[in-house]
């Protein structure tokens, strides 16, 4: 698994650099996660097809993975803070299901989808820190979480192939557009 | 072979629009992120706009915003850039180019450059 | 939009020189940071990404350094084919370019 931020040899290296602003530390956590992603998504394009697919909208039937679109505010036209801050939070409390899911599938990489799945939640709790109207954030339901793995971890491998790589490309295109939109904060 | 073909410049009077189209090969723009970026005649390198293929989110400089749309055609592997009320300030060769990585870290593959002329 | 300042804005060496371009950021952008080359009538090549990481086949004489809000670029031997214009560039957000540096022959 990758060093968590703030453990990186730079930091190591320069110990009397600044400490990192709330900004910046959330900025690299979405990188780690990022970073995370990138090794669990070679593990799922190598062992099969999946990236090269064409099938993927089968599998997408089955999920409601959260995207960002131009009503969140998140985008440059029309950028509002605090309606995309809680959009991202809402978000990655939505992903949270979908991180558990994958927890069972992988072999190499088991280390690193847990960690991708423990930094999901530091970075909720930073950001959750920053956000000013929490509660304007809904908190998704746990028996429709359990339900909604129950059903996911039911499909046939093909399928739980595709809704793995389908949730790894989605988590890495949310935390994107969150790590662009996090900057014009 | 990854390469970028630009076509659509050319000479406009003040106040009219241009489009400029960039046809990618070698990779799909669907999954790069891609950008604009102009030189004024002995100038130097200004960027003009860039779209994260995640939503098509388009991002603009200041001296562009509200006149210049970034856009994208994924079935032809295409890019573009609008250009309305156009000033004699836009004129200079417009580069599109590839932004390299997940995270955009530099410029990793460059259009040959169109010349943009905003002239009565 | 971040506002990069370069400086100097132009540069008078001779080949063998050990040459520095520093460039600032107006906010803080971690280490998002390219340097480019630019000769007359062609598109600029990346030298360095992420302040300090050297470009595939790029000669190790360029170096970069820097992060936050300054950075350098260093050239500690100057070579004739060296002799352009330089630009900085930041991608933390946008992709705003520094006013770039002409290094010419002295």
């Known amino acids: 698994a990758p060093v968590p931020p703030g453990e990186d040899s730079k930091d190591v290296a320069a110990p009397h650099r600044q400490p990192l602003t709330s900004s910046e530390r959330i900025d690299k956590q979405i990188r780690y996660i990022l970073d995370g992603i990138s090794a669990l998504r070679k593990e799922t394009c190598n062992k099969s097809n999946m990236c090269e697919s064409s099938k993927e909208a089968l599998a997408e039937n089955n999920l409601n993975l959260p995207k960002m679109a131009e009503k969140d505010g998140c985008f440059q036209s029309g950028f509002n803070e605090e309606t995309c801050l809680v959009k991202i939070i809402t978000g990655l409390l939505e992903f949270e299901v979908y991180l558990e899911y994958l927890q069972n599938r992988f072999e190499s990489s088991e280390e690193q989808a847990r960690a991708v799945q423990m930094s999901t939640k530091v970075l909720i709790q930073f950001l959750q820190k920053k956000a000013k109207n929490l509660d304007a954030i809904t908190t998704p339901d746990p028996t429709t979480n359990a339900s909604l793995l129950t059903k996911l971890q039911a499909q046939n491998q093909w399928l739980q192939d595709m809704t793995t790589h389908l949730i790894l490309r989605s988590f890495k295109e949310f935390l994107q557009s969150s790590l662009r939109a996090l900057r014009q904060m | 072979e990854v390469q970028l073909v630009q076509s659509g410049g050319g000479l406009i009077q003040p106040g009219g629009s241009l489009r400029l189209s960039c046809a990618a090969s070698?990779?799909?723009?669907?999954?790069?992120?891609m950008i604009w970026v102009r030189q004024a005649p002995g100038k130097g390198l200004e960027w003009v706009s860039d779209l994260y293929y995640y939503a098509g989110d388009t991002y603009y400089a200041d001296s562009v915003k509200g006149r210049f749309t970034m856009s994208r055609d994924i079935s032809k592997n295409t890019v573009y850039l609008q250009m309305n009320s156009l000033r004699a300030e836009d004129t200079g060769v417009y580069y599109c180019?590839?932004?390299?990585?997940?995270?955009?870290?530099?410029?990793?593959?460059w259009g040959r450059g169109t010349l943009v002329t905003v002239s009565s | 939009d971040i506002v990069m300042t370069q400086s100097p804005s132009t540069l008078s060496a001779s080949v063998g020189d050990r040459v520095t371009i520093t460039c600032r950021a107006s906010?803080?952008?971690?280490?998002?940071l390219a340097w480019y080359q630019q000769k007359p009538g062609r598109a600029p090549k990346v030298l360095i990404y992420?302040?300090?990481t050297l470009e595939s086949g790029v000669p190790s004489r360029f170096s970069g350094s820097g992060s936050g809000t300054d950075f350098t670029l260093t050239i500690s031997s100057l070579q004739p084919e060296d002799f352009a214009t330089y630009y900085c560039?930041?991608?933390?957000?946008?992709?705003?370019f520094g006013q770039g540096t002409k290094l010419e022959i002295k």
């Open positions: 560039q930041q991608s933390w957000l946008g992709g705003s």
């Open positions: 180019a590839r932004w390299a990585d997940d995270h955009p870290s530099h410029i990793d593959v």
């Open positions: 070698g990779f799909t723009i669907s999954s790069n992120y």
């Open positions: 906010q803080g952008i971690s280490s998002w």
């Open positions: 992420k302040a300090s």
